[in-house]
């Protein structure tokens, strides 16, 4: 049995998969910050996790997915104060008893050192210095991401 948060996450991912393919994103939209091959939008308002998830979806983006510790550190460097927390796209899957990214993959335990409990209705937030398990109903800020399309140099045959 899936929790309401898991259902919400799955529904949003499926609706995104059904939409027609859009042209690749070469530059970050206004107000979005480029971090390597991603565009990030740091919210100024607050929401519970599932509303944050939905907000990113309406912006044709997703809650932030963090590949590794290096990306985490670079993202944290963009947070201006230690008392600001941001939701990312990771929550506890009760059915699988594991931390699960909204793209369906599971957390590699080496990637993030999470402070707090792994239990039902727990979602992951990041601050300037740490990664926290918070109750998903907590209203904090959130980070949306869009992937930039890598520009490949065309190789022309010798003429």
């Amino acid at each position: 049995q899936k929790s309401s948060i898991e259902k919400c996450s799955v529904d949003i991912q499926q609706s995104r998969n059904k939409t027609t393919e859009r042209p690749g994103l070469l530059n970050c939209p206004i107000y979005w910050q480029q971090l390597r091959e991603k565009c990030l939008l740091f919210s100024h308002t607050v929401n519970p996790w599932n509303n944050s998830l939905a907000d990113c979806s309406t912006k044709e983006s997703s809650l932030l997915l963090i590949r590794d510790k290096d990306e985490l550190i670079h993202t944290q460097n963009l947070i201006r104060d230690k008392a600001i927390l941001f939701w990312i796209g990771l929550n506890f899957s009760l059915s699988e008893k594991n931390w699960k990214w909204i793209n369906g993959s599971f957390l590699n335990s080496n990637d993030l050192e999470i402070r707090g409990d792994a239990k039902e209705n727990s979602c992951i937030s990041i601050s300037q210095t740490s990664v926290y398990s918070e109750y998903c109903s907590t209203e904090i800020r959130w980070i949306c991401q869009k992937e930039l399309t890598p520009v490949r140099n065309k190789v022309y045959p010798d003429s």
Epitope: R115, D117, E134, S137, E139
Partner: antibody, heavy 119, light 107 residues
Framework: EVQLVESGGGLVQPGGSLRLSCAAS????????MSWVRQAPGKGLEWVSA????????YYADSVKGRFTISRDNSKNTLYLQMNSLRAEDTAVYYC????????????WGQGTLVTVSS | DIQMTQSPSSLSASVGDRVTITCRAS??????LNWYQQKPGKAPKLLIY???SLQSGVPSRFSGSGSGTDFTLTISSLQPEDFATYYC?????????FGQGTKVEIK
């Protein structure tokens, strides 16, 4: 109805310790950051400390860092402030308030508890 | 730390008067400013958050404006229950800081 009720204040000698409690009701306590704010007699408001909903993250004013410890017990819906190495300048009414993440405002406050540090 | 400076420190006014209190931040705080009312022996009460949003249950005679460094709290028509001390507070960065207060007294 949201209610915050502080207790634990009193008279303590300089260098002494005291633990304040704040009992919360009327809302999902674990979903909110909480703070302590103090007010010295006849003076303005001073933010003291804040803690995240899970308790994993804490913040302090420089004036109390290393001497005060904020904590919470979500199973008891209670916020705490452990105050050690108390000084005369810590004399104040201590309020607990709901809020503490930026950009939270403090939307609910307790009635306050008076801490007097004097020999 | 961000310093918050209120002016005036105190003012005398009559019932029905329009009252304006200003708050200046030592650096830009965007719209992360709140206003509180405190009566003697009581806890503060949130009036305005995010510079201009009226807290639920607060009378519409209270309003807030401003962004960046300069902010204003306006009471359009002062009522007997409005005689109190008013504080501004920034929630842009830690430590969270308050203005020194403005005491509104009966003329």
């Amino acid at each position: 109805e949201v209610q915050l009720v502080e207790s634990g204040g009193g008279l303590v000698q300089p260098g002494g310790s005291l633990r304040l409690s704040c009992a919360a009701s009327g809302f999902t306590f674990s979903s909110y950051a909480m703070s302590w704010v103090r007010q010295a007699p006849g003076k303005g408001l001073e933010w003291v400390s804040a803690i995240s909903g899970s308790g994993g993250s804490t913040y302090y004013a420089d004036s109390v860092k290393g001497r005060f410890t904020i904590s919470r017990d979500n199973s008891k819906n209670t916020l705490y402030l452990q105050m050690n190495s108390l000084r005369a300048e810590d004399t104040a009414v201590y309020y607990c308030a709901r809020g503490g993440y930026l950009p939270d405002a403090f939307d609910y406050w307790g009635q306050g508890t008076l801490v007097t540090v004097s020999s | 730390d961000i310093q918050m400076t209120q002016s005036p420190s105190s003012l005398s006014a009559s019932v029905g008067d329009r009252v304006t209190i200003t708050c200046r931040a030592s650096q830009s705080i965007s719209s992360y400013l709140n206003w509180y009312q405190q009566k003697p022996g009581k806890a503060p009460k949130l009036l305005i958050y995010a510079a201009s949003s009226l807290q639920s249950g607060v009378p519409s005679r209270f309003s807030g404006s401003g962004s960046g460094t300069d902010f204003t709290l306006t009471i359009s028509s002062l009522q007997p229950e409005d005689f109190a001390t008013y504080y501004c507070q920034q929630t842009y960065s830690t430590p969270l800081t308050f203005g020194q207060g403005t005491k509104v007294e009966i003329k």
